[in-house]
């Protein structure tokens, strides 16, 4: 089958890093500078991606693979293959059209990217708030109020009091 295919289409024999050159009677030609073909049988080589401005090069282009970009410090990637760079914010903030804004009360963001999310509603799970939420951290839910009734306390009991008249050594 491979042989039949190559007899029908000479371009199918062109390996990665080359293209099927119509100007040369369909013989395989190496990709010109700053272009690549990552698969065989290509009729053109693709222009290498250039990581400019807020993008920086994570992997150089070669004749068989495209360049890969990431973002300069203070920015993070968005989209497939890091097609966009978005500004970082601080924890406790989210990026709006007007820039980084603090999370509203009742919401938090523990990352430098993304949006502020509501604190967990502990009562929905029948639990109580053990640690209050902040702009940077979600609340920590603890045992349900019922669990804290006398005799069922999960809180560590206080240390026994010393007997009177005994001073520490």
């Amino acid at each position: 089958f491979e042989r039949t295919r190559s007899l029908q289409d000479p371009c199918s024999n062109c390996p990665a890093g080359t293209f099927c050159d119509n100007n040369r009677n369909q013989i395989c030609s190496p990709c010109p500078p700053n272009s690549f073909s990552s698969a065989g049988g290509q009729r053109t080589c693709d222009i290498c991606r250039q990581c400019k401005g807020v993008f920086r090069t994570r992997k150089e282009c070669s004749s068989t693979s495209n360049a890969e970009c990431d973002c300069t410090p203070g920015f993070h990637c968005l989209g497939a293959g890091c097609s966009m760079c978005e500004q970082d914010c601080k924890q406790g903030q989210e990026l709006t059209k007007k820039g980084c804004k603090d999370c509203c009360f009742g919401t938090f963001n523990d990352q430098k990217r993304g949006i502020c999310r509501p604190w967990t509603n502990c009562s929905l799970d029948g639990k109580s708030v053990l640690v209050n939420g902040t702009k940077e951290r979600d609340v920590v839910c603890g045992p349900s109020p019922a669990d804290l009734s006398p005799g069922a306390s999960s809180v560590t009991p206080p240390a026994p009091a010393r007997e009177p008249g005994h001073s520490p050594q």
């Epitope: 890093g17 190496p30 990709c31 010109p32 500078p33 700053n34 150089e60 282009c61 070669s62 004749s63 068989t64």
Partner: nanobody, 111 residues
Framework: AVQLVESGGGLVQPGGSLRLSCAAS????????WSWYRQAPGKQRELVAW???????HYTDSAKGRFTISRDNTKKTMYLQMNSLKLEDTAVYYC?????WGQGTQVTVSS
């Protein structure tokens, strides 16, 4: 323009070796892709081995493991070391860079 002259072809028995040379003259410093092609009687010219613009050596399936491309920039020369030659390697071998071609050197593998 760049001028290319191949040498080193000849008659060799199956299993033998040859080393082809391609001497370049002219403004070679702008050239970033160097290739060896071959053309067997009655067949289309085909790519054998090449230095890509990223300086990495590449080989087509027919050359992998048997042929080695190299170059000496100080001598403006590219080489093709061909080992374990087969009858089907018989062809005229051409050196290429950009639009420049050498005149070719004949390689005949015969017992």
């Amino acid at each position: 323009a760049v001028q290319l002259v191949e040498s080193g072809g000849g008659l060799v028995q199956p299993g033998g070796s040859l080393r082809l040379s391609c001497a370049a003259s002219g403004n070679i410093f702008s050239i970033r892709v160097w290739s060896w092609y071959r053309q067997a009687p009655g067949k289309q010219r085909e790519l054998v081995a090449w230095f890509a613009w990223d300086n990495i050596a590449h080989y087509t399936d027919s050359a992998k493991g048997r042929f080695t491309i190299s170059r000496d920039n100080t001598k403006k020369t590219m080489y093709l070391q061909m080992n374990s030659l087969k009858l089907e390697d018989t062809a005229v071998y051409y050196c290429n860079s950009g639009d420049s071609w050498g005149q070719g050197t004949q390689v005949t593998v015969s017992s």
